[in-house]
């Protein structure tokens, strides 16, 4: 058993029917001695007396908040949750293995630059008592400072038959180079309740690692005389790092027709201009990637043809 | 249809070039000894990320540009950043601080350079012959050398009396992959930005 | 005391379906994930299908994906396995299992697909 | 399909040391806990070692288990008539998990 903060706690179990659970002692946090009673969550029914309480903790009933009184008065709360470990493995029912980029990836984060900021997010089918707690820092055994903000819920889908929800949080390197090179990763780690459920959840990478650069700005088409050619520019994103000619993009160019089954032309280009021929119903779209760094392409950036 | 990109004019600045190639060779190296061995622990993940230049060099330092100079966490080991202007090119006129830059991009390489022949020297004895280094990246890495044109006393090649451990030699391999790409990338940013300045 | 009793299997034609059920008592049910296993006549064992504890998950192996679903009723304390377009190479003894570091195995129940 | 390999079979007279060793890989054994199941011919599998070196109550102290880097073993100290059977390591694997990974399975004859 272990504080999670003031007056709660988390029961580690090793989860399996007829596991013999885990004893717990509580004590009412009181100066008094005499005349103390116990009850669990809203029954009234008297679970023992004396200043500690010693419980068997087994199943989820036997979580919950056990309060300590006297004579009609709340003396002091314990809330008690449960942390389950099937199998040598701690449990993740809460959140959604998203399976980007592999298997059992619970927490996806990317960043638009190398400043030390970067935003996580989540899923889960939970819509009710549910909160979340996040922590980061740059590595484990010295960790160094991240400042992550509240975990918000950022979005809402329809999945089949079930709705499913998305949680993002924010979170900033107190003291980033953007043009160190990382050798400590970024720990990432989420605390989930659900009613009296428990679950923690980790997610360890270099920032170089998740770059994500917003899409190109600006993309503008200029019509070359006397040709079916155009000439394609388009500009750094603002949130991408500074100076552009240390912290490079490459972009691709594509060419697409109306429909999805059309061939499409591409063209890889460190310029922030190329030229292409712009078919009739096409659409250019231009992508943007670290020059120098292969990690995530930019989503893409569109205007039509015509 | 994928076509090729266009490679910028590399008469002006030829470290630039060189830089490129090399970030090039050392990324197809990694991936090569990724696939080749895949039952090490060679992935990103699972590697202890060691820097061999570390406190021997100080290149993210030295070569700092002067944009971020005003950023407070990138000047905490360092007292002056480089005032960019000039190139690999002999003919012009280098700064002081460009030159230490440089010099300390020619340390880097020396640096990876004995430790890639001294490894490549190990693997050459597995009975294995799983993996050796690529030719084309240790030339690279020379040609770069030759184009920063330092003269720097010859470090010797480290030779070792005792029964190589292949496994360990392996896992290092990675460990060394892994950094140097990681410096090849900033060696890359840093051409690119003395090639704008 | 866990218990865990199996029924449903049988012989079959190729191409054919069959049902096996689990019925489980001596514990909280629907606390528990539960997992199908099978082991053919003189071969090793073979993990099939995973459940979570409310149904919101399955696993499947991939020699049974698309073919067999896993399933639960909660609030009957059993276990399903449904499998459709058998093949000869289904031919086994199946048991259904509880999933944490102490498990508990069914009896096993032989399914057989022959013409 | 099996990514737990075992040797096919192993034998030892009564009273002997018998080891049955299972190999496996980073993302399976080496990341996650081993089993060791015994299976009787016609019955169900019964659980001997859980969490790599941990006995269910019941288990005689003659079976122990044991894990290093990458493979697992079950040892049989002063083996019995009544231990001959067949013996299965079970884990996971970090990329399938709750998938149930099986060892090829080793006979165990008492000559």
């Known amino acids: 058993i272990w504080e999670l903060k003031k007056d709660v706690y988390v029961v580690e179990l090793d989860w399996y029917p007829d596991a013999p659970g885990e004893m717990v002692v509580l004590t009412c946090d009181t100066p008094e001695e005499d005349g103390i009673t116990w009850t669990l969550d809203q029954s009234s029914e008297v679970l023992g007396s004396g200043k500690t309480l010693t419980i068997q903790v087994k199943e989820f009933g036997d979580a919950g908040q056990y309060t300590c009184h006297k004579g009609g008065e709340v003396l002091s709360h314990s809330l008690l949750l449960l942390h389950k470990k099937e199998d040598g493995i701690w449990s993740t029912d809460i959140l959604k293995d998203q399976k980007e980029p592999k298997n059992k990836t619970f927490l996806r984060c990317e960043a638009k630059n190398y400043s030390g900021r970067f935003t996580c997010w989540w899923l889960t089918t939970i819509s009710t008592d549910l909160t979340f707690s996040v922590k980061s820092s740059r590595g484990s055994s010295d960790p160094q400072g991240v400042t992550c903000g509240a975990a918000t819920l950022s979005a809402e889908r329809v999945r089949g038959d079930n709705k499913e929800y998305e949680y993002s949080v924010e979170c900033q390197e107190d003291s980033a180079c953007p043009a160190a090179e990382e050798s400590l990763p970024i720990e990432v780690m989420v605390d989930a309740v659900h009613k009296l459920k428990y679950e923690n959840y980790t997610s360890s990478f270099f920032i170089r690692d998740i770059i994500k650069p917003d899409p190109p700005k600006n993309l503008q088409l200029k019509p070359l005389k006397n040709s079916r050619q155009v000439e394609v520019s388009w500009e750094y994103p603002d949130t991408w790092s500074t100076p552009h000619s240390y912290f490079s993009l490459t972009f691709c160019v594509q060419v697409q027709g109306k429909s999805k089954r059309e061939k499409k032309d591409r063209v890889f280009t460190d310029k922030t201009s190329a030229t292409v021929i712009c078919r009739k119903n096409a659409s250019i779209s231009v992508r943007a990637q670290d020059r120098y760094y292969s990690s995530s392409w930019s989503e893409w950036a569109s205007v039509p043809c015509s | 249809r994928n076509l090729p990109v266009a490679t910028p004019d590399p008469g002006m600045f030829p470290c630039l070039h060189h830089s490129q190639n090399l970030l090039r060779a050392v990324s197809n190296m990694l991936q090569k000894a990724r696939q080749t061995l895949e039952f090490y622990p060679c992935t990103s993940e699972e590697i202890d990320h060691e820097d061999i230049t570390k406190d021997k060099t100080s290149t993210v330092e030295a070569c700092l540009p002067l944009e971020l100079t005003k950023n407070e966490s990138c000047l905490n080991s360092r007292e002056t950043s480089f005032i960019t202007n000039g190139s690999c090119l002999a003919s012009r006129k280098t700064s002081f601080m460009m030159a230490l830059c440089l010099s300390s991009i020619y340390e880097d390489l020396k640096m990876y350079q004995v430790e890639f022949k001294t490894m490549n020297a190990k693997l050459l004895m597995d009975p294995k012959r799983q993996i050796f280094l690529d030719q084309n990246m240790l030339a690279v890495i020379d040609e770069l050398m030759q184009a920063l044109n330092f003269n720097s006393e010859t470090v010797p090649q480290k030779s070792s009396l005792e029964e190589p451990d292949f496994y360990k030699t392996k896992i290092k391999l990675c460990i060394l992959l892994h950094a140097f790409r990681i410096r090849a990338v900033t060696i890359d940013r840093v051409m690119s930005y003395l090639n704008a300045s | 005391q866990v218990q865990l009793v199996q029924s449903g299997g049988g012989v079959v034609q190729p191409g054919r379906s069959l049902r096996l059920s689990c019925a489980a008592s001596?514990?909280?049910?629907?606390?528990?994930?539960m997992h199908w296993v099978r082991q053919a006549p003189g071969k090793g064992l073979e993990w099939v299908a995973f459940i979570r504890y409310d149904g919101s998950n399955k696993y499947y192996a991939d020699s049974v994906k698309g073919r067999f679903t896993i399933s639960r009723d909660n609030s009957k304390n059993t276990l399903y396995l449904q499998m459709k377009s058998l093949r000869a190479e289904d031919t086994a003894v199946y048991y259904c299992?509880?999933?944490?570091?102490?498990?508990?195995w069914g009896q096993g129940t032989m399914v057989t697909v022959s013409s | 399909s099996y990514v737990l390999t075992q040797p096919p079979s192993v034998s030892g007279t009564p009273g002997q040391r018998v080891t049955i060793s299972c190999s496996g890989g980073r993302s399976n054994i080496g990341n996650n806990t081993v089993k060791w199941y015994q299976q009787l011919p016609g019955t169900a599998p019964k659980l001997l070692i859980y969490?790599?070196?941990q006995r269910p109550s019941g288990v005689p102290d003659r079976f122990s288990g044991s894990k290093s880097g990458t493979s697992a073993s079950l040892a049989i100290t002063g083996v019995q008539a009544e231990d001959e059977a067949d013996y299965y390591c079970q884990s996971y694997d970090r990329g399938t998990h709750p998938a149930l990974l099986f060892g090829t399975g080793t006979k165990v004859t008492v000559l």
């Open positions: 001596g514990f909280t049910f629907s606390s528990y994930g």
């Open positions: 969490g790599n070196d």
């Open positions: 299992k509880t999933h944490g570091s102490h498990d508990n």
